[in-house]
Interface confidence: medium
């Protein structure tokens, strides 16, 4: 069988938008299955047509309604006779049109007055491509080749840049770049503090605007009184917007205030925030825990818990706990020293343990009680155990 | 003179397998590719797919890849559609066209100019 | 999956011209084709390749295509016209046909 590309030259250049018809002819074939290719893939489309010359004599046409860049490349077509694959000279299809732009100015953030570039490149076919800058409405500099950067010394307000690429089918103009100018950041918002203990806090907040330049750290200051004394500044890269306090004083009032910076400076601070950290829990386990049988159940008696520092604060209730073997367990809450204890069951050994509370948390446990249930009624059970 | 004979109207319960044909005639059949088209009662024509005239590669729509299979027999001239479970949303006019090619002149070609009178197949319990 | 899109009636008056247009995101790159369906027929090919007309069809039909618009007109509507049209291109990559959902066209 022969093949040919008919009607078309080895090389064919189209200008974008308009149809092309590849003809190839098939002599010697009485019904060949022509396939087009392009770049070594075989064409799936539907834009195939064959029409039979004569019995041995075959056009098969590849039709492009409106080309684009995309359809430039190497086109064969090839049919199969007798198991091999037949293919024809190749003709390579060039796509002409406007300049097509590969790198357009991007949008910038710059402080006053400080020098920076923009870059434009575009392409052909045809070439050459020339580019032309534009700041705002006026044209700046002469015709450039492609690729082209602009090196402005500096702007003082937010202003407009585009570029425009020029070749002999025409022109083509870029998106437009704005240059912000930079500035100092706004002031954080919504500061929250979080996670109060005695000792530590979380803060967390929201920054203001970046003023057009990254957010490089935040400063918080903490104060015993707002405008007193600084007691802690910590600076935090950011993000994340949090910070961690430490080695604060229990039962504190405190305030602070948060301030970012990008890098022309800091923010104002934001307001301050005041809060307080808790006491200390109670450092004391309360002591001769023991225990009355009565006729109506058990008695549970305990001595006093003193507090120890004054960053204790008020102490009390008691918290009470109590477990069997049988897997019964419970907690009350008690106010005074004393604690009647209903729903255990006599028959089963009985565990106790109490811990004096204040605002912050229950202290530590007491040693455990052991009630045995081989005591007599009316008997006081003394620990068994002194681990704690 | 260009002819297409399709297979006569069909009644179906859901779930029964079908195949409609499509014999051609007084043109080569291995000229022209066979497409199969749709119509639903009183709705539009939809694109079902194609078969080349090699028969030997098919194209379908996204609606029907899967549902229903085309083929052809290039020794009898005949185009096929075939469904293996019908569902009561089958219901419509099926036509078989000639599409590709052109005239004997090799100047005009014949888009979808010359179609099947139809078969219609009715799919109800 | 792709779409062309008519709308579903045009009526005009016998001697008036009628537009029916077709549009579709790939016709920019694709053909299209024009069908007319009288009821109870077959439909038949009236234009192809966006302008040309089918042979055996009157002149008074024409089409034509800009970017993702295709449009037939029938200069001078005749009553015998009435009938459902329906556009037919290919999706972007050509891997398949579509048809318009079909337009029709009242000639009062």
């Known amino acids: 069988a022969g093949l040919k590309l008919m009607g078309a030259p080895v090389k064919l250049t189209v200008s974008q938008g308009q149809p092309v018809k590849l003809n190839c002819s098939v002599e010697g074939m009485e019904e060949p299955d022509i396939q087009w290719v392009k770049d070594g893939a075989v064409v799936q489309n539907l834009d195939q047509l064959y029409i039979p010359v004569s019995e041995q004599h075959w056009i098969g046409f590849l039709s492009l309604k409106s080309v684009e860049r995309s359809d430039a490349g190497r086109y064969w077509c090839q049919v199969e006779d007798g198991g091999e694959t037949e293919i024809s000279q190749p003709v390579w299809l060039t796509v002409e049109g406007v300049p097509f732009f590969t790198v357009e100015p991007k949008d910038l953030a710059v402080p006053p007055n400080a020098p920076f570039q923009l870059s434009c490149e575009a392409v052909g076919p045809p070439e050459p491509v020339t580019i032309v800058w534009w700041r705002g409405t006026t044209k700046i500099g002469g015709p450039a080749p492609s690729p082209s950067v602009l090196n402005v010394t500096g702007v003082t307000q937010s202003t407009m840049f585009s570029c425009e690429a020029h070749n002999l089918k025409g022109l083509a103009s870029s998106r437009t770049a704005t240059v912000h100018l930079q500035a100092l950041p706004a002031a954080p918002f919504n500061i929250t503090v979080t996670k109060l203990s005695s000792s530590n806090a979380s803060v967390a907040w929201m920054p203001g605007a970046d003023g057009r330049a990254l957010l490089q750290s935040c400063t918080v200051q903490v104060t015993q009184a707002p405008g007193g004394w600084e007691v802690l500044a910590v600076v935090v890269p950011v993000p994340p917007f949090t910070c961690l306090l430490r080695d604060l004083v229990p039962a504190t009032n405190y305030s602070l205030r948060v301030r970012c910076a990008n890098a022309l400076g800091p923010s104002p601070y934001a307001d301050w925030v005041p809060f307080q950290t808790k006491g200390l829990a109670p450092a004391s386990a309360p002591q001769n825990l023991h225990a009355i049988r009565t006729d109506s159940g058990l008695i549970l008696e305990w001595e006093e818990v003193i507090p120890e520092a004054p960053l204790e604060g008020p102490l009390g209730p008691y918290k009470l706990s109590w477990v069997q073997d049988n897997g019964t367990q419970d907690e009350l809450t008690v106010e005074g020293t004393r604690a009647n204890l209903t729903g255990w069951d006599p028959q089963k050994d009985l565990i106790v343990r109490v811990c004096v509370s204040n605002a912050v948390g229950c202290g530590p446990w007491s040693q455990p009680l052991v009630v045995s249930s081989h005591d007599r009624a009316g008997q006081q059970g003394p620990p068994h155990s002194r681990t704690s | 003179e260009v002819q297409l004979v399709q297979s006569g109207a069909d009644v179906k319960k859901p779930g029964a397998s079908l195949t409609i044909s499509c014999q051609a005639s007084g043109y080569t059949f291995t000229d022209y590719w066979i497409s199969w088209v749709r119509q639903k009662p009183g709705k539009g024509l939809e694109w079902m797919g194609q078969i080349n005239r090699h028969a030997s590669n098919t194209m379908y729509g996204p609606s029907f890849q899967g549902h229903v299979t085309i083929s052809a027999d290039r020794s009898t001239a005949t185009a096929y559609l075939q469904w293996r479970s019908l569902e009561a949303s089958d219901t419509a006019m099926y036509y078989c066209?000639?599409?590709?090619?052109?005239?004997?002149?090799?100047?005009?070609?014949?888009?979808?100019?010359?179609w099947g009178p139809g078969t219609l197949v009715t799919v109800s319990s | 999956s792709y779409e062309l899109t008519q709308p579903p009636s045009v009526s005009v008056s016998p001697g008036q011209t009628a537009r029916i247009t077709c549009s579709g995101d790939a016709l920019p790159k694709k053909y299209a084709y024009w069908y007319q369906q009288k009821s109870g027929q077959a439909p038949v090919l009236v234009i192809y390749e966006d302008w040309k007309r089918a042979s055996g069809i009157p002149e008074r039909f024409s089409g034509s295509s800009s970017g993702t618009m295709a449009t037939l007109t029938i200069s001078g509507a005749q009553v015998e016209d009435e009938a459902d049209y329906y556009c037919?291109?290919?999706?972007?990559?050509?891997?398949?046909?579509?048809f318009g959902g079909g337009t029709k066209l009242t000639v009062l």
């Open positions: 037919y291109s290919q999706e972007r990559k050509g891997n398949y046909f579509v």
């Open positions: 066209v000639r599409s590709g090619g052109a005239t004997s002149g090799g100047t005009i070609p014949e888009y979808y100019q010359h």
